[in-house]
């Protein structure tokens, strides 16, 4: 478990552009601190790949049932993974028909975690 | 053009550390994804892991965890793989291999020349 | 772990025949599969990506199919520069596994 005094505070600052195909998805994490410009959605994906989405986005929200039906179902204790848990992040296009260059803002890492290629993160202490 | 260069071939003794870069031109460095892969003599392709240049995260392949350590340094667009602790059956070339594509996909576009990594008392 | 199993190991063909190599995926990966050629003493080559959508710039006598566990890559008129190990590469999880390959030889 980080140390909840010194745990580092994770930031969106753009937002995917694309649907993340549903199937691709291993569950979320919502940033909804003050400290952040914007509230973000986290989908971390089976690659452990994490992607920040606009969580006003109605794909973004169906997503986000769709995750806590599927988690309800196989960890009725946890409704999503501890940031911990979230591994790595990656470069987007994310249609799986490639040929985009990674937009590194719009996948993000905590201090914490092991990959990412996007947003920034800082540590609040 | 795209283009990956790494170091040279690497002679070293059982229970040392080698460690290869992998220089990246042609693209931008922090904008993907690098991984590496090995190839013992004679044999198939191995993931080992990738390093996120952005912000130098990392994922391993379990059974390198605890022996490998992906590094990279941005202001010379390079990457680095360490691997510890040596055995004779690391013997191998190492590849670092970019990697093009999405949250959920994974494709290696271009790949380094190799670096032949022998292990011998 | 996912297992990728290439079959045949080696094959040998003529200059201008169609070459068929299969790879069984041991768990359901959709279209998660990739093909990469290998030439000796060189790096992979990407020439299939998502089971059957050719690389940019890779002639299209290369061709890939299939899904769920079972894909097919195939060359339809064998080059005398197509002699080489070939690979499928699964995404679908991780770790990211490989066949173990199929070496190509003409005859």
């Known amino acids: 478990q980080p140390d909840a005094v010194n745990a580092p505070l994770t930031c969106c600052y753009s937002f995917t552009s694309k649907m993340i195909p549903m199937s691709r998805l291993e569950s979320y994490k919502r940033i909804t601190s003050s400290r952040c410009p914007k509230e973000a959605v986290v989908f971390v994906t089976k690659l452990k790949r994490e992607v920040c989405a606009d969580p006003k986005k109605e794909w973004v929200q169906t997503y986000i049932k769709n995750l806590d039906r599927n988690q309800m179902r196989s960890e009725p204790t946890t409704l999503f993974k501890t940031a911990s848990a979230l591994r790595s992040s990656a470069p987007l296009n994310v249609k799986l028909t490639r040929k985009s260059e990674a937009n590194a803002s719009t996948t993000f890492s905590t201090t914490t975690s092991s990959t990412s290629v996007g947003v920034t993160s800082v540590t609040v202490n | 053009q795209v283009q990956l260069v790494q170091s040279g071939a690497e002679v070293k003794k059982p229970g040392a550390s080698v460690k290869v870069s992998c220089k990246a031109s042609g693209y931008t460095f922090t904008g993907y994804y690098l991984h590496w892969v090995r190839q013992a003599p004679g044999q198939g392709l191995e993931w080992m892991g990738w390093i996120n240049p952005y912000n130098d995260g990392t994922n391993y392949a379990q059974k390198f965890q605890g022996r490998v350590t992906m590094t990279r340094d941005t202001s010379i667009s390079t990457a680095y793989m360490e691997l510890s602790r040596l055995r004779s059956d690391d013997t191998a070339v190492y590849y670092c291999?970019?990697?093009?594509?999405?949250?959920?996909?994974?494709?290696?576009?271009?790949w380094g020349q190799g670096t032949l990594v022998t292990v011998s008392s | 772990d996912i297992q990728m199993t290439q079959s045949p190991s080696s094959l040998s063909a003529s200059v201008g025949d169609r070459v068929t190599i299969t790879c069984q995926a041991s768990q359901d990966i959709t279209t998660y599969l990739n093909w990469y050629q290998q030439k000796p003493g060189k790096a992979p080559k990407l020439l299939i990506y998502?089971?059957?959508n050719l690389e940019t710039g890779v002639p299209s006598r290369f061709s890939g199919s299939g899904s769920g566990t079972d894909f097919t890559f195939t060359i339809s008129s064998l080059q005398p520069e197509d002699i080489a190990t070939y690979y499928c590469?699964?995404?679908?999880?991780?770790?990211?596994?490989f066949g173990q390959g199929t070496r190509l030889e003409i005859k």
């Open positions: 590469q699964q995404y679908d999880n991780l770790p990211i596994t």
């Open positions: 998502d089971a059957s």
């Open positions: 291999a970019r990697d093009i594509a999405a949250a959920g996909a994974v494709y290696f576009d271009y």
